[in-house]
Interface confidence: medium
């Protein structure tokens, strides 16, 4: 009679994470008597997956039990596969004894697990940056297998080319991670812009995963200031306005100084939003010129988003009769607190 052979017909099996893997094994004889065991890996560190004779293996189901004692099909199904289950599985016949001894092993079946990448997470710089600066964005995705993966960067639908990508680990692993860093040059129009990281993998069936970052969380557009003066109908009164334009984010504090002394401080509240996402705001002072003997230096000082203050000054000549000095470029919003200086 021919000696028993252990046949594992499949050299490799590929299964998506979460599914069941069927590992086939048949023996060609009922002799010698003894149990079958399944192991992952070979050598002394091999891991017992299923022991026909004893043990409790909640994820393992025997595929065939139809003839029980005469059974020669020892295929198993392993449920709820994860990337950690990847490896080579051996069906091993033991000869009955005290203890049972290994008789013959199958050639092994390599189980590879197709793991979906996690949703890409895009993160930007910790601090805001101003236009014309280059900022870095990172994109991370984990848990995918096999190793082959494609990552692309986009800004407002336009593909970026300045990025570096690494897939770890370099060697064989049950699952992999990807890490990519893209460099983006900010412009004043980027408040509404988006940076997108797109990951394509065999497990996604042509439907890539995307992670996004809004540049509104990264950009700071500093304001431009303009101080102007217009006469008002009342004699000896002048209206001085400070137009704060094209700033982002909204967090802004304005202080009026009269000859270097603080006159009023206010916080931008009712602002006007521009199409590009930046804001405009205007504050004014109603100045009673007759209360002053000398010229008055009025300064509009703006602290934007915690940055060092910027200012614009305007010299108010009190010796001359009030007349138009500069033009009023009307902002959409003229609401602010009036303040008379006496």
């Amino acid at each position: 009679e021919e000696e028993l052979q252990v046949i594992q017909p499949d050299k490799s099996v590929s299964v998506a994470a979460g599914e069941s893997a069927i590992l086939h094994c048949t023996v060609t004889s009922l002799i010698p008597v003894g149990p079958i065991q399944w192991f992952r890996g070979a050598g002394p560190a091999r891991e017992l997956i299923y022991n026909q004779k004893e043990g409790h293996f909640p994820r393992v189901t025997t595929v065939s039990e139809s003839t029980k004692r005469e059974n020669m099909d020892f295929s198993i199904s392993i449920s709820n596969i994860t990337p950690a289950d990847a490896g080579t599985y051996y069906c091993v016949k033991f000869r009955k004894g005290s203890p049972d001894t290994e008789f013959k092993s199958g050639a092994g079946t390599e189980l590879s697990v197709r793991g979906k990448p996690s949703a890409p997470v895009v993160s930007g710089p910790a601090a805001r940056a101003t236009p014309q600066h280059t900022v870095s964005f990172t994109c991370e995705s984990h848990g995918f297998s096999p190793r082959d993966i494609t990552l692309k960067w986009f800004k407002n639908g336009n593909e970026l080319s300045d990025f570096q990508t690494n897939v770890d680990p370099v060697g064989e692993s049950v699952s992999y991670s990807i890490h990519s860093t893209a460099k983006v040059v900010l412009t004043r129009e980027d408040v509404h812009s988006q940076v997108i990281c797109e990951v394509a993998h065999v497990t996604l069936q042509g439907d890539p995963l995307r992670g996004t970052a809004n540049l509104s969380e990264t950009i700071r557009v500093p304001p431009t200031l303009e101080v102007t003066q217009q006469p008002v109908r009342a004699e000896n009164q002048v209206n001085v306005t400070c137009q704060v334009r094209k700033f982002y984010p909204q967090r802004l504090q304005l202080t009026w100084l009269e000859n270097g002394n603080v006159s009023r401080t206010e916080t931008a509240s009712t602002v006007t939003e521009n199409k590009d996402g930046t804001y405009n705001w205007m504050s004014w002072l109603l100045v009673n010129v007759s209360a002053h003997r000398d010229d008055v230096k009025l300064t509009c000082q703006v602290e934007h988003d915690g940055q060092p203050a910027v200012s614009k000054s305007h010299d108010l000549k009190v010796s001359a009769h009030p007349k138009e000095q500069g033009s009023n470029t009307a902002a959409e919003n003229t609401g602010s607190n009036e303040r008379n200086i006496y």
Partner: antibody, heavy 120, light 107 residues
Framework: QVQLVESGGGVVQPGRSLRLSCAAS????????MIWVRQAPGKGLEWVAS????????YYADSVKGRFTISRDNSKNRLYLQMNSLRAEDTAVYYC?????????????WGQGTMVTVSS | DTVLTQSPDSLAVSLGQRATINCGAS??????MHWYQQKPGQQPKLLIY???NLEAGVPSRFSGSGSGTDFTLTISSLQAEDVAVYYC?????????FGQGTKVEIK
């Protein structure tokens, strides 16, 4: 042919101990997992404990955990159930049964049973 | 624990007629469901193992089906010697629970 013969049953007072024995013959005892199952008078079957062929894997029902101990002696082809701190609700016919190979297999041969009565 | 619920609790069937017993599991036991027959004053006897496999020596009028949580034992043509209590039992995971039993009688 396969035979399983239980012994050691009897009347015992609550809180006392009893040791049941199951003598196996007609098969290679060391190849099989063994089980104790009990049946209270007029009631259904209740699994009590299991022991694998090499005694590596032992399981108990919650109702007996900490009080009962299952063991085996493969050299003597015997299965044991040491029952301590017995209660009235332990009154039942106790069957030993064998299980062919792995834990997912059925109990294919049963003994005739031995009666345990716990009463004061 | 996996709770097994048999229905009906008792069943009266005419000789030669079909008898069907159901066993529902509170969670999946895959195919690890077995059926036993216990006649009065006797020990249980294995009829069907792993949901649908007929134990050696058991008449072919007995059959089993199902997987997961719903299982059925069928006696295609009831004989007088089939009067007994029938139990389902799962071996998917300890504790290895039994159903409460179904008593089959002749109508």
């Amino acid at each position: 042919q396969v035979q399983l013969v239980e012994s050691g049953g009897g009347v015992v007072q609550p809180g006392r101990s009893l040791r049941l024995s199951c003598a196996a013959s007609g098969f290679t005892f060391s190849d099989y997992g063994m089980i104790w199952v009990r049946q209270a008078p007029g009631k259904g079957l209740e699994w009590v404990a299991s022991i694998s062929s090499s005694s590596s894997y032992i399981y108990y029902a919650d109702s007996v955990k900490g009080r009962f101990t299952i063991s085996r002696d493969n050299s003597k082809n015997r299965l044991y159930l040491q029952m301590n701190s017995l209660r009235a609700e332990d009154t039942a016919v106790y069957y030993c049964a064998r299980r062919y190979y792995g834990f997912n297999y059925p109990f294919d041969y049963w003994g005739q049973g031995t009666m345990v009565t716990v009463s004061s | 624990d996996t709770v097994l619920t048999q229905s009906p609790d008792s069943l009266a069937v005419s000789l030669g007629q079909r008898a069907t017993i159901n066993c529902g599991a509170s969670k999946s036991v895959r195919t690890y469901m077995h059926w036993y027959q216990q006649k009065p004053g006797q020990q249980p006897k294995l009829l069907i193992y792993s949901a649908s496999n007929l134990e050696a020596g058991v008449p072919s009028r007995f059959s089993g089906s199902g997987s997961g949580t719903d299982f059925t034992l069928t006696i295609s043509s009831l004989q007088a010697e089939d009067v007994a209590v029938y139990y389902c039992q799962q071996s998917n995971e300890p504790p290895y629970t039994f159903g409460q039993g179904t008593k089959v009688e002749i109508k």
